[in-house]
């Protein structure tokens, strides 16, 4: 019996087609993805093949003006229209709190939404019960397939799930649910979830009875053969893991932003064992036409967005590199721009001894969600900025000891190379790392811009000195693992909305040209 698994993950509000780098579509003939194009390909496969499942591994929420305006209603509407069979909850599904998940998505979805390792407690338990499920048995052709969901247990650090949801260890939570499916005579089981590629592989290895793992969160691109676009494969598609009980378990992920449709064919024997698996992500480029009915619907929903944020704020004459490939690995000029805007927004010349009360900015690279292409006449709109900074956060003022900052910069690179969001972009700081050293001892130089000076210059960080720093509220609250900031901050004052800070700066400057200038080495 053959099953076709079509899968997406980390779509992040890319309902419309995008440029190749997943930013706003500029030249339509070269644009990719979007739900109208996705639907064309899905329908083509549904017509050609008998047993097809369309699955999403989480993080539909957050990323463009679509989410800013529609707050998840767009996700439910268009996923319903595409007839998704199931979705796993991602961390970003909690960005507007639990209510922001329940009202627009959980109540409106016509497909099961899954997570076995999220347990509700208190009054929320009844309110949310039955709206998301640990697993779902789906009829496919003449067979049944069990789908069991999971969500990153880091979600409380990454989003806003509140205090009444407990995020358990994925493997511990999944095993009893898979066992339950076995007792229901379900012998073909897919783990669908959002914890990143490393956890996906662990689930394949450790959870007895899981036949296939469909993942997300780490934006992992897997491909067999010559990749069709810019993404460099992290491994073959599917990635085969040998489980502890000796089975070959295929693990897949489909990059992000709706650029690819994961396409995996699995052959099962009559006892539900995987005999073979093969496939590849399908690049959703302009050779695939956009479905006219979905496109018309998109255009109808688009009207509200056009009124929202299309006026020009200013211009850029350089490419604003906000790609995760840059901002999570090295200094990126988008990070420099944002940090400069954050400092500029906090210029307060209240003391003759100080040129300003604050000179430093830190910004988690994972918080930068999109680049901006200068080739659109250099125009920057609120909409462009909403794709870069989609989380609706604030840029806050904190006071920290030098020793806390040192810990923060060690944390920034403690697992460097895995495209994780904690890599820090900076302003008013020069940092030098030696990545050949062991984690926790990689910061070899950390100089900070003086404030008590008439001519600003860089001096070595003093461990016992108290410094003012501008940073996202996400970091002030210990997000991305920066627990030391939350635990050790001496003062915290909330600031202005992130997009507003950057848009005000761009409007003030009129033309911007941020460079990569050696802040991080």
């Amino acid at each position: 019996w053959e099953l076709t698994i079509l899968h997406t993950n980390d779509v992040h509000s890319r309902l419309e087609q995008t440029s190749e780098d997943s930013s706003k579509c500029v030249n339509a003939s070269r644009c990719m993805g979007g739900v109208a194009r996705l639907f064309t390909k899905v329908q083509q496969i549904r017509r050609a093949e008998p047993n097809v499942l369309l699955l999403d591994a989480g993080d539909q929420y957050q990323g463009t003006i679509w989410f800013t305006v529609y707050k998840g209603a767009e996700v439910a509407h268009f996923m319903n229209a595409l007839r998704y069979d199931a979705m796993a909850l991602g961390n970003h599904e909690f960005d507007n709190g639990v209510e922001g998940l329940i009202e627009p998505l959980l109540k409106e979805a016509k497909f099961p939404i899954l997570s076995a390792n999220i347990k509700a407690k208190g009054p929320l338990a009844s309110q949310i019960s039955g709206l998301y499920l640990p697993y779902k048995v789906l009829p496919v052709g003449d067979e049944v397939v069990g789908i069991v969901g999971y969500t990153s247990k880091e979600t409380p650090f990454l989003s806003n799930p509140g205090t009444n949801l407990v995020f358990e260890d994925e493997i511990t939570a999944l095993q009893p649910e898979v066992d339950k499916l076995k007792t229901l005579n379900v012998n073909k089981i897919i783990a669908l979830g959002h914890s990143g590629f490393e956890m996906d592989k662990l689930i394949a290895q450790k959870v007895r009875g899981v036949d296939v793992v469909v993942g997300g969160h780490s934006n992992t691109f897997l491909y067999t053969g010559n990749p069709p676009s810019k993404e460099v494969p992290a491994g073959k598609y599917p990635f085969i893991v040998t489980s502890d009980d000796g089975r070959k378990v295929p693990v897949v992920q489909a990059y992000a932003f709706g650029k690819y449709l994961g396409y995996l064919k699995i052959e099962f024997d009559e006892r539900g064992n995987v005999i073979s698996s093969h496939g590849n992500p399908i690049l959703l480029n302009s050779s695939i036409p956009e479905d006219p009915s979905i496109k018309a619907d998109i255009n109808k929903w688009r009207i509200k967005l056009d009124n929202y944020s299309t006026q020009e704020l200013g211009k850029t004459i350089v490419y604003l590199d906000g790609s995760s490939q840059s901002c999570r690995f090295r200094e990126c000029n988008m990070g420099n721009l944002i940090c400069d805007a954050m400092i500029n927004n906090n210029l307060r010349h209240t003391d003759e001894m100080f040129w300003n009360h604050v000179s430093m900015c830190i910004l988690n690279g994972g918080g930068i969600r999109s680049p901006i292409d200068e080739r659109n006449n250099g125009t920057i709109t609120w909409e462009n900025l909403a794709a870069v900074l989609p989380f609706g956060g604030t840029f806050d003022l904190v006071q920290l000891k030098g020793s806390t900052l040192k810990k923060a910069f060690e944390h920034s690179v403690h697992r460097y190379g895995q495209s994780t969001g904690e890599f820090l972009q900076v302003g008013g700081i020069h940092v030098v790392y030696d990545l050949s050293r062991k984690p926790g001892d990689r910061v070899v130089k950390l100089d900070v811009l003086c404030t008590k000076c008439r001519v600003p210059s860089y001096d070595p960080l003093k461990m016992d000195e108290v410094y003012k720093v501008i940073l996202p509220n996400f970091l002030a609250n210990g997000g991305d693992g920066f627990q030391m900031i939350k635990d050790e901050l001496l003062r915290h004052d909330s600031g202005d909305q992130d997009i507003n800070v950057v848009s005000t700066y761009i409007s003030k400057m009129k033309v911007i040209y941020p460079a990569v200038e050696g802040r991080i080495k």
């Epitope: 709206l131 229901l184 005579n185």
Partner: antibody, heavy 120, light 107 residues
Framework: EVQLVQSGAEVKKPGASVKVSCKAS????????MHWVKQAPGQGLEWIGY????????EYNQKFKDKATLTADTSASTAYMELSSLRSEDTAVYYC?????????????WGQGTTVTVSS | DIQMTQSPSSLSASVGDRVTITCRAS??????LNWLQQKPGGAIKRLIY???RLDSGVPSRFSGSRSGTEYTLTISSLQPEDFADYYC?????????FGGGTKVEIK
């Protein structure tokens, strides 16, 4: 299109038995459960139980445990409910309803109903 | 067993009226609730499942809501084809149980 076609009306004497059938089409019979529901004249609905035709697992409402026997023939895509030791209070319309395999969202399609009349 | 108390048992309304039917569960059933429609000929159709979710092909004038253990079916603008009996049904724990029904009649 999902269809559940039930057998025709039955008139039985007290003490007799009756077997009502429910023929499923338009979907894979073993991929869903089958529920049975009673509606006495002028009354509301009462759940009798369900069968999973894949595993043949059966769950009864305790009230009907000694009254109803649920079976299924997967080769014929047909579910059956046998009512034994009939009494006048068993006079009712009996419905079959397709159920969710794992019972998370239940009873989405219903048969047209079979009238069983118990009369001496 | 979980008791489902449905009210009103009958109501008279005109085409275009907004109609609400409520069901109260004797204990917590979360969102494990269906709303069913039974036409005069006896045919039964599920309208809403999981308290809020509309079945395919069901007009958007039907909606479900909840406050604690009280569940509401709302018909925003009653149409001629909506005159029927309506039942709530819980599937949170065995045995599944139904409300007593509400007959919606033409005024």
């Amino acid at each position: 299109e999902v269809q559940l076609v039930q057998s025709g009306a039955e008139v039985k004497k007290p003490g007799a038995s009756v077997k009502v059938s429910c023929k499923a089409s338009g979907y894979t019979f073993t991929s869903y459960t089958m529920h049975w529901v009673k509606q006495a004249p002028g009354q509301g609905l009462e759940w009798i139980g369900y069968i999973n035709p894949n595993s043949f697992y059966i769950e009864y409402n305790q009230k009907f445990k000694d009254k109803a026997t649920l079976t299924a023939d997967t080769s014929a895509s047909t579910a059956y409910m046998e009512l034994s030791s009939l009494r006048s209070e068993d006079t009712a319309v009996y419905y079959c309803a397709r159920g969710d395999y794992d019972l998370f969202y239940d009873m989405d399609n219903w048969g047209q109903g079979t009238t069983v009349t118990v009369s001496s | 067993d979980i008791q489902m108390t449905q009210s009103p048992s009958s109501l008279s309304a005109s085409v275009g009226d907004r109609v609400t039917i409520t069901c109260r569960a004797s204990q917590d059933i979360g969102n494990s609730l269906n709303w069913l429609q039974q036409k005069p000929g006896g045919a039964i159709k599920r309208l809403i499942y999981a308290t809020f979710r509309l079945d395919s092909g069901v007009p958007s004038r039907f909606s479900g809501s909840r406050s604690g253990t009280e569940y509401t079916l709302t018909i925003s603008s009653l149409q001629p084809e909506d005159f029927a009996d309506y039942y709530c049904q819980q599937y949170a724990s065995f045995p599944w149980t139904f409300g007593g029904g509400t007959k919606v009649e033409i005024k």
